[in-house]
């Protein structure tokens, strides 16, 4: 079977790490230095990716697999296979064309990347704000105001009797 297949298409027998060399009557040749082929049957080897500048090498290139890059400290990867490096900002900021800017009031960012997002609107779920939001943190929603009003039905045990004139906390 191997002999038959190789007569039909000799290139199909070339394993990863090699290419089908047209200059040598289509025999399989190992990839030249700093190139790779990650699958069999290739007619060329691909040039290894070089991680330069803001990119740094996460995995070295080999004859059967490309190099993998990540970003130097202070930057993070964007795109498939870390095709770009973007500057980090602090929590509570977002990256704009003019650099890192604080989140506007009513928005937050709890990461070093990405954009500022609006605080959760607790009232949309019929809840109240338990903890106020900041530039770095979203609001924390608590029980609905109705749950806090006197006489409201609740699955929790009733609070101890209070002196007249004192409303619940």
């Amino acid at each position: 079977f191997e002999r038959t297949r190789s007569l039909q298409d000799p290139c199909s027998n070339c394993p990863a790490g090699t290419f089908c060399d047209n200059n040598r009557n289509q025999i399989c040749s190992p990839c030249p230095p700093n190139s790779f082929s990650s699958a069999g049957g290739q007619r060329t080897c691909d040039i290894c990716r070089q991680c330069k500048g803001v990119f740094r090498t996460r995995k070295e290139c080999s004859s059967t697999s490309n190099a993998e890059c990540d970003c130097t400290p202070g930057f993070h990867c964007l795109g498939a296979g870390c095709s770009m490096c973007e500057q980090d900002c602090k929590q509570g900021q977002e990256l704009t064309k003019k650099g890192c800017k604080d989140c506007c009031f009513g928005t937050f960012n709890d990461q070093k990347r990405g954009i500022c997002r609006p605080w959760t609107n607790c009232s949309l779920d019929g809840k109240s704000v338990l903890v106020n939001g900041t530039k770095e943190r979203d609001v924390v929603c608590g029980p609905s105001p109705a749950d806090l009003s006197p006489g409201a039905s609740s699955v929790t045990p009733p609070a101890p009797a209070r002196e007249p004139g004192h409303s619940p906390q």
């Epitope: 790490g17 190992p30 990839c31 030249p32 230095p33 700093n34 070295e60 290139c61 080999s62 004859s63 059967t64």
Partner: nanobody, 111 residues
Framework: AVQLVESGGGLVQPGGSLRLSCAAS????????ISWYRQGSGKQRELVAW???????HYVDSVKGRFTISRDNTKKTTYLQMNSLKLEDTDVYYC?????WGQGTQVTVSS
């Protein structure tokens, strides 16, 4: 240029072993990839085993687990240890680096 000379071929019975040698001379500092090929009469030259540029040894499926490529840089020599030889391993074996080829050494597996 690099000059390559193979040796170690011969007649062996099925299941036997041979060790081929490939001695390099000339501008050997340029050698990054070195390979063993084999070719029978009227057949395509076939890659068998090689040291890639990253110094990793590779083998084609038909010889994996039976053949081992190694090298002795002090002797400027690359070896192909061939164990559990089969009738279909009969071929002329060539050493290659870049555009340089050895003259070949005949390996015959026969009972």
């Amino acid at each position: 240029a690099v000059q390559l000379v193979e040796s170690g071929g011969g007649l062996v019975q099925p299941g036997g072993s041979l060790r081929l040698s490939c001695a390099a001379s000339g501008n050997i500092s340029s050698i990054r990839v070195i390979s063993w090929y084999r070719q029978g009469s009227g057949k395509q030259r076939e890659l068998v085993a090689w040291f890639a540029w990253d110094n990793v040894a590779h083998y084609v499926d038909s010889v994996k687990g039976r053949f081992t490529i190694s090298r002795d840089n002090t002797k400027k020599t690359t070896y192909l240890q061939m164990n559990s030889l089969k009738l279909e391993d009969t071929d002329v074996y060539y050493c290659n680096s870049g555009d340089s080829w050895g003259q070949g050494t005949q390996v015959t597996v026969s009972s």
